[in-house]
Interface confidence: medium
Amino acid sequence: LEVQVPEDPVVALVGTDATLCCSFSPEPGFSLAQLNLIWQLTDTKQLVHSFAEGQDQGSAYANRTALFPDLLAQGNASLRLQRVRVADEGSFTCFVSIRDFGSAAVSLQVAAPYSKPSMTLEPNKDLRPGDTVTITCSSYQGYPEAEVFWQDGQGVPLTGNVTTSQMANEQGLFDVHSILRVVLGANGTYSCLVRNPVLQQDAHSSVTIT
C-alpha cells in the first residue's frame, strides 16, 4: 500500500494549527471498517492519534489532534494538530493498514517570528566622534535560534566587537541579546537585524547617532 506525505517539512507558527498531510489510494469497495490508521511520533513511537474498527479512537497527544473523518473514505488520512508548540517539532509517521500495509513520515518544523528589536545606547549623551559606545539589541520570543547581523548606515556589515547570546524560555522560545561596541564616526547609523532562518523573516531596528 502506497502512503504519500509531502517531502518538505510542514512549517507551522507557534500557537496556530497545522495539517500533516497523509494520503493513500483506496481500492474499489473499500470500507472504513477495514481501515487501521495510526499516527505516531517517529522517534519515540509515542501514539498520537488512531482510527480502527470504523471508529476514530481519538487523540493520545494532549487532546490537540484530529483527523478529517469525512475525507478518510477518499484516502485522506491527514492529521490536524492544534495550537502548535515548540515541543511538537519533529517527525510524525502515518501508518495505514487495510489488507496491505504502508507508512511514511512527515516532518513538522515549528517557527515563531522575533519581535522588532529594541535598541539601547550607552552612554547616551555627550557623545563625540572617537568615543566608544555600546549598542544593545534585544529581540524576544522567536523560534528557532536567530541569526543576528549588524551593519552601518551604508549597509556595511559590522562583525568586529559583537557579543550575541540566546536563551530559550520554558515554552522553548528564544530571546536574543546582542551587543555591538563601536567607535563613533562623525555621525552614524547602526542597524541590528534579527533573522528567523526558517521563516526568512527579518526584524530590524536602527539607531542614529549625530
Epitope: 519581535s115 539601547t120 534585544s138 520570543q141 547570546s165 536563551m167 530571546d175 541579546h177
Partner: antibody, heavy 116, light 107 residues
Framework: EVQLQQSGPELVKPGASVRISCKAS????????IHWVKQRPGQGLEWIGW????????NYNERFKGKATLTADKSSSTAYMQLSSLTSEDSAVYFC?????????WGQGTLVTVSA | DIVLTQSPSHLAASPGETITINCRAS??????LAWYQEKPGKTNKLLIY???TLQSGVPSRFSGSGSNTDFTLTISSLEPEDFAMYYC?????????FGAGTELELK
C-alpha cells in the same frame, strides 16, 4: 536615565494578598522583560519570574506559581506583582529588574512584612 | 535547578589590593554567568554578563573569567567604593538562579 521606581513598604496580615508596583522610565517599556526577585535576610536572591510588556507573556519559577501573579500596564509603563495567601515565609524585599535574562536595571526594592 | 556556590562568603581586603571571588555551578552553564554588586542605599548594579563581558559604564578593574562550571570575578586595585556584596547569577537556563553572595569588607 533608566529608572525602575517601586512602591513603598507593605505590612500585611497572614492569608491576605498584596500588590506591589514598578514604574519604568527612561526607556521604551517594551524593550525589556520586567523580572521580579525575592530577597530574604540571609537567604540570598531568588528569581520569581518575568513579564514581557510587549505582549504580556509571563514566565514563572515553578516555586512561585500560584504565589505570584505578574501583570503590566503599557499605558503607564508600570509592572505589578501580586502575592497571595501570604505567610511569614513571604516576608522579604522584592525587587523588579529590567533585562533579558540578566538584569541591567534594578528597582530600589519593596519590603513586604507579613505579621498578625 | 542549577545551584551556584559562591566562595568565599566573606572577604576582607584593603584598597589597592586585587581580589577574586569564585562561583561554581552544579552543572555546565557554558559561559552564561553574570555578576552584580549590591550596596546599601543604592540599586543593584550589573557588572559582567556572559562570563566576561563588561557592562557599559563599569570600570575596567572589574573582570570576569571562566566557563562551564567554574567562574571568577576579579577586582584589581580595589577602590573604597568597591566594598560591597557581590552575587553571581546564571543565565543559561530557567529558572534563573543566584549564588548566596560574597561580602567584601574593608580590612
Amino acid at each position: 536615565e533608566v529608572q525602575l521606581q517601586q512602591s513603598g513598604p507593605e505590612l500585611v496580615k497572614p492569608g491576605a494578598s498584596v500588590r506591589i508596583s514598578c514604574k519604568a522610565s527612561g526607556y521604551t517599556f517594551t524593550s525589556y522583560y520586567i523580572h521580579w526577585v525575592k530577597q530574604r535576610p540571609g537567604q540570598g536572591l531568588e528569581w520569581i519570574g518575568w513579564i514581557y510588556p510587549g505582549n504580556v507573556n509571563t514566565n514563572y519559577n515553578e516555586r512561585f506559581k500560584g504565589k505570584a501573579t505578574l501583570t503590566a500596564d503599557k499605558s503607564s509603563s508600570t509592572a505589578y506583582m501580586q502575592l497571595s495567601s501570604l505567610t511569614s515565609e513571604d516576608s522579604a524585599v522584592y525587587f523588579c529588574a529590567g533585562g533579558t535574562y540578566f538584569f541591567a536595571y534594578w528597582g530600589q526594592g519593596t519590603l513586604v512584612t507579613v505579621s498578625a | 535547578d542549577i545551584v551556584l556556590t559562591q566562595s568565599p562568603s566573606h572577604l576582607a581586603a584593603s584598597p589597592g589590593e586585587t581580589i577574586t571571588i569564585n562561583c561554581r555551578a552544579s552543572k555546565s552553564i557554558s559561559k552564561y554567568l553574570a555578576w552584580y554588586q549590591e550596596k546599601p542605599g543604592k540599586t543593584n548594579k550589573l557588572l559582567i554578563y556572559s562570563g566576561s563581558t563588561l557592562q557599559s559604564g563599569v570600570p575596567s578593574r572589574f573582570s570576569g573569567s571562566g566557563s562551564n562550571t567554574d567562574f571568577t570575578l576579579t577586582i584589581s586595585s580595589l577602590e573604597p567604593e568597591d566594598f560591597a556584596m557581590y552575587y553571581c547569577q546564571q543565565h543559561n537556563e530557567y529558572p534563573l538562579t543566584f549564588g548566596a553572595g560574597t561580602e567584601l569588607e574593608l580590612k
